[in-house]
């Protein structure tokens, strides 16, 4: 026998107090897909979190972080602060890159300088907090 | 046991306003995400207006904005819907729902009453 709920699109949940007829999700609820017997809360972009994308009846909010934040984890779980090219962001701030590293963007950490003796050449332009030296023949 | 008793529905011309009522029971309006949602003829149930105080905010639908404002109040323990500029397309019987929010995180709502029958017809 078929699931009478199968037939509840998405944006409604299955109505167990009305005999599993299909009703629309609740404000600030969404259900992305068909034959579920509750809706899910949409997400709420709070804080450092600003919405992207508006929770609809069938799809969840997106979410991504204000200016001087970038996203990280999946679906932008978390916003990490930005810092300037030439550093890296520790526990205690952003702090800049030492030397023989480099960063050239507002994340992540800084990375050494590449060895260019390694591949028998040699340094045609210094390398900075900024930028990664270029190798020459 | 949760109850919710609807009033205040009737003819009305277009253009015509009307206030509707839903007395509690059971709960705490104030305390709880509430609102109206409403059937059409033949249609199926669409959600008209709510006080939503997880996310802070009051919702209205679309085809309900500027003309449909609600309120509640907190010492009778009842919630309002005042409709104004009233169109055909507002008949429909007009249900006051709880919102429900499940342990596992999910969300229904509970419509107890009979509702109260809107016609907008000249």
């Known amino acids: 026998l078929q699931d009478p709920c199968s037939n509840c699109p998405a944006g409604t949940f299955c109505d167990n107090n009305r005999n599993q007829i299909c009703s629309p999700c609740p404000p600030n609820s969404f259900s992305s897909a068909g034959g579920q017997r509750t809706c899910d809360i949409c997400r709420q972009c709070k804080g450092v979190f600003r919405t992207r994308k508006e929770c609809s009846s069938t799809s969840n909010a997106e979410c991504d972080c204000t200016p001087g934040f970038h996203c990280l984890g999946a679906g932008c779980s978390m916003c990490e602060q930005d810092c300037k090219q030439g550093q890296e962001l520790t526990k205690k701030g952003c702090k800049d890159c030492c030397f023989g590293t480099f960063n050239d963007q507002k994340r992540g950490i800084c990375r050494p300088w590449t060895n260019c003796s390694l591949d028998g050449k040699s340094v045609l332009v210094n390398g900075t907090k900024e930028r990664d030296v270029v190798c020459g023949p | 046991e949760v109850q919710l008793l609807e009033s205040g529905g009737g003819l009305v011309q277009p253009g015509g306003s009307l206030r509707l009522s839903c007395a509690a029971s059971?709960?705490?309006?104030?305390?709880?995400?509430v609102g109206w949602v409403r059937q059409a003829p033949g249609k199926g149930l669409e959600w008209v207006s709510a006080?939503?105080?997880?996310?802070?905010?009051?919702y209205y639908a679309e085809s309900v904005k500027g003309r449909f404002t609600i309120s509640r109040d907190n010492a009778k323990n009842t919630l309002y819907l005042q409709m104004s500029s009233l169109r055909a397309e507002d008949t429909a019987v007009y249900y006051c729902?709880?919102?429900?929010?499940?342990?596992?995180?999910?969300?229904?709502?509970?419509?107890r009453g009979q509702g109260t029958q809107v016609t907008v017809s000249s």
């Open positions: 006080i939503l105080d997880f996310g802070g905010s009051t």
């Open positions: 059971g709960f705490t309006v104030s305390a709880e995400d």
């Open positions: 729902a709880r919102v429900v929010y499940h342990a596992g995180g999910g969300v229904t709502f509970d419509t």
